[in-house]
């Protein structure tokens, strides 16, 4: 590979590293679960994530925070969308594990490929967000 | 050892303007989003604005907004408030914080903090 | 803007007392953004408190946060001479990113 092209990925790398995602993850996981309150979900399930959404949070309350944050960490990456790309796929990865079921992750993911449009970012064009243990072909 | 040290800090007519200057070290300044926090005398903590890692998210409180520019050098390690139009209630120490986050949980606090430069409006 | 009010404005009490500090918001505060600093005259704030409910490094166990929604609060325990300050709630989720004004908490 040629040097320009390793140091991109180094700076894409430490990029990451200083980037909070979670308010990223916390806004999707809100949008989803206030999706399926409305759709006779019990909003009072109990969670594991102490800074998940309260039944309170989750009808709207709250969430434009997670959203502003996220949406702050995400235009970080806005001049490099390979990077950006990584980002997503890192969100994807984070809360995969807390997905009940193929219906919510792929209704998470369709948020997920929304969120630098919403964010009034440029989103990027082939970003593979299948979670797999295996190695992923990104581009 | 991890410090900001704030200066800048003066007396100045209304009207007037002032740059401060807040110089990091001990740690990779580029790493972390900067914010600037006030106090008047006898008064709260007041924030007035913040960058984040490369300045492309900048906010501002409404008192300042039009008035006060922040911006953030990485190479020198160094952030700056420059403020013009000055007013009699602009009067205040300003302190220089670092933001940072949990980790595991994502958070954000102000963990580290200068020990301040005081700016006096005054005729 | 969120605004917080933090209540009372001065708290009176003995070393060996607990003390119960409140911080209500104007709308609705994600725990994630909820964050307690401690103030001791001709000093710089310190971080006391993160997420509602997280102690900082170095903070003892006597100092706790807690709450949700609009209303939080900082409890301390056993108050100890080193505790007087003035304690300050901050929320950092929405921009503008606003204080409390402050509760002052003095020995009686």
């Known amino acids: 590979r040629q040097q320009w092209e390793l140091q991109g990925d180094r700076r894409c790398q430490s990029q990451l590293e200083r980037a909070n995602l979670r308010p990223c993850e916390q806004h999707l996981m809100q949008k989803i679960q206030r999706d399926e309150d409305s759709y006779g979900r019990d909003p009072y399930s109990p969670s594991q994530d102490p800074y998940s959404p309260s039944p309170y949070d989750r009808r709207g309350a709250g969430s434009s925070q997670h959203q502003e944050r996220c949406c702050n960490e995400l235009n970080e990456f806005e001049n490099n969308q390979r990077c950006m790309c990584e980002a997503l796929q890192q969100i994807m990865e984070n809360q995969s594990d807390r997905l009940q079921g193929r219906q919510q992750e792929q209704q998470f993911k369709r948020e997920l490929r929304n969120l630098p449009q919403q964010c009034g970012l440029r989103a990027p064009q082939r970003c593979d967000l299948e979670v797999e243990s295996g190695g992923r072909d990104r581009y | 050892e991890v410090q900001l040290v704030e200066s800048g800090g003066g007396l100045v007519q209304p009207g007037g303007s002032l740059r401060l200057s807040c110089a990091a070290s001990?740690?990779?300044?580029?790493?972390?989003?900067m914010n600037w926090v006030r106090q008047a005398p006898g008064k709260g903590l007041e924030w007035v604005s913040s960058?984040?890692?490369?300045?492309?998210?900048?906010y501002y409180a409404d008192s300042v907004k039009g008035r006060f520019t922040i911006s953030r050098d990485n190479a020198k390690n160094s952030l700056y408030l420059q403020m013009n139009s000055l007013r009699d209630e602009d009067t205040a120490v300003y302190y220089c914080?670092?933001?940072?986050?949990?980790?595991?949980?994502?958070?954000?606090?102000?963990?580290?903090w200068g020990k301040g430069t005081t700016v006096t409006v005054s005729s | 803007e969120i605004v917080l009010t933090q209540s009372p404005g001065t708290l009176s009490l003995s070393p060996g007392e607990r003390a119960t500090l409140s911080c209500r918001a104007s709308?609705?505060?994600?725990?994630?953004?909820l964050v307690w600093y401690q103030q001791k005259p001709g000093q710089a704030p310190r971080l006391l408190m993160y997420?509602?409910?997280t102690r900082a490094t170095d903070i003892p166990d006597r100092f706790s946060g807690s709450g949700s929604g609009t209303d939080f609060t900082l409890t301390i325990s056993r108050l100890e001479p080193e505790d007087f300050a003035v304690y300050y709630c901050?929320?950092?989720?929405?921009?503008?990113?606003?204080f409390g004004q402050g509760t002052k908490l003095e020995i009686k």
């Open positions: 709308q609705s505060v994600s725990n994630m953004f």
């Open positions: 914080a670092r933001e940072d986050f949990d980790v595991s949980t994502g958070p954000y606090y102000m963990d580290v």
């Open positions: 901050q929320q950092n989720g929405n921009s503008p990113y606003t």
């Open positions: 960058i984040t890692r490369s300045s492309r998210t900048i």
């Open positions: 001990g740690f990779i300044f580029s790493d972390y989003n």
């Open positions: 997420g509602a409910s």
